[in-house]
Interface confidence: medium
């Protein structure tokens, strides 16, 4: 089974060392997920030329992937802790259907794909505990997710490769922005 941060013997605190704070655990957890995404991107890039495509060309897609915007309060200018935390949790919840889609998209990194999915679920739980403003967080409708998943899986091979690449790149971008913003909280 995939090892989550904190379960690996290397992560066990040494005698006399300080236990990780909640923020440090979240930070470490996000970096663990980013490591997983990196491994998945490697497999994707090795089997298709999507990684060589220009960002502008890739932008011409109809995927509605979560993205940080100025209004979300997660950037240095206009930073707002509560608004940003809601955006991070909402965004991660929206990414879950896309992470489910990735589950059958990898051969050699199948376990890694599962680890990214499971770690994201744990991260959401961590962050929900941290959030005071829980009523502002909207959870995607299960029926909407189910039909989106069906639609994505019905695409041709080229579009599925493109979708996989876009999900990984967007998720990395979202997690990086989240990581940076959470350090300010």
């Amino acid at each position: 089974a995939p090892v989550l941060p904190g379960e690996d013997s290397k992560d066990v605190a040494a005698p006399h060392s300080q236990p990780l704070t909640s923020s440090e655990r979240i930070d470490k957890h996000i970096r663990y997920i980013l490591d997983g995404i990196s491994a998945l991107r490697k497999e994707t890039c090795n089997r298709s030329n999507m990684c060589e495509s220009s960002k502008e060309a890739l932008a011409e897609n109809n995927l509605n992937l979560p993205k940080m915007a100025e209004k979300d309060g997660c950037f240095q200018s206009g930073f707002n802790e509560d608004t940003c935390l809601v955006k991070i949790i909402t965004g991660l919840l929206e990414f879950e259907v896309y992470l489910e889609y990735l589950q059958n998209r990898f051969e050699s990194s199948e376990e890694q794909a599962r680890a990214v999915q499971m770690s994201t679920k744990v991260l959401i739980q961590f962050l929900q505990k941290k959030a005071k403003n829980l009523d502002a967080i909207t959870t995607p409708e299960p029926t909407t997710n189910a039909s989106l998943l069906t639609k994505l899986q019905a695409q041709n091979q080229w579009l599925q490769d493109m979708t996989t690449h876009l999900i990984l790149r967007s998720f990395k971008e979202f997690l990086q922005s989240s990581l940076r913003a959470l350090r300010q909280m």
Epitope: D35, S38, Q76, S77, R169, K172, Q176, L179, R180, R183
Partner: antibody, heavy 122, light 109 residues
Framework: EVQLVESGGGLVQPGGSLRLSCAAS????????MSWVRQAPGKGLEWVSA????????SYADSVKGRFTISRDNAKNTLYLQMNSLKPEDTAVYYC???????????????WGQGTQVTVSS | QSVVTQPSALSVTLGQTAKITCQGG??????AHWYQQKPGQAPVLVIY???SRPSGIPERFSGSSSGGRATLTISGAQAEDEGDYYC???????????FGGGTHLTVLG
Amino acid sequence: EVQLVESGGGLVQPGGSLRLSCAASGFTFSSYAMSWVRQAPGKGLEWVSAINSGGGSTSYADSVKGRFTISRDNAKNTLYLQMNSLKPEDTAVYYCAKEGDTGWKDPMYDYWGQGTQVTVSS
Amino acid sequence: QSVVTQPSALSVTLGQTAKITCQGGGLRSSYAHWYQQKPGQAPVLVIYDDDSRPSGIPERFSGSSSGGRATLTISGAQAEDEGDYYCQSADSSGNAAVFGGGTHLTVLG
């Protein structure tokens, strides 16, 4: 137009001190983290120190820790680097750099000053 | 301190494609940013967040990253692209910027 202008460099003896300044204009200085990056003659870039937008959080390269102090005055749109106990290996061009909006602590520099030369020699 | 490694020099024929690579463990969880520096001038950001190009940077510059390896690609290198290119990431704590040693690009012909 974003502008960063460094000053305060010069020739100083080993063990001496210098205070570098970086005057910023063309952007909301108080909203952005700032850094100092140096480049020794014929060498590559080396990150020296960073400070967050409000000035409450700072970080330093191991090579300068305990000797250099970064600070900022948001009212004056100015970044500073106080350099004490200078060593010959501190000889370099010192650049002031603005962190991009993606940079909290994982920094990226979208604008740089032209640099100020610091020479430490007896 | 994280280490980011890149080749010290690279030559490319005018109009051909140049690929500069950068490797380091930190690149798995941090973005790669690329800077161009010409003699006597300050560095200029040419690619940020692995594959994003700042406004004003020619389209021939592109970037990609996977598995702890980042690549800067210059498609159809021009004489004015000659100079030093630095890859930059963050250390494992995210507190410090880490620069590669720089790659000197020579455009032949």
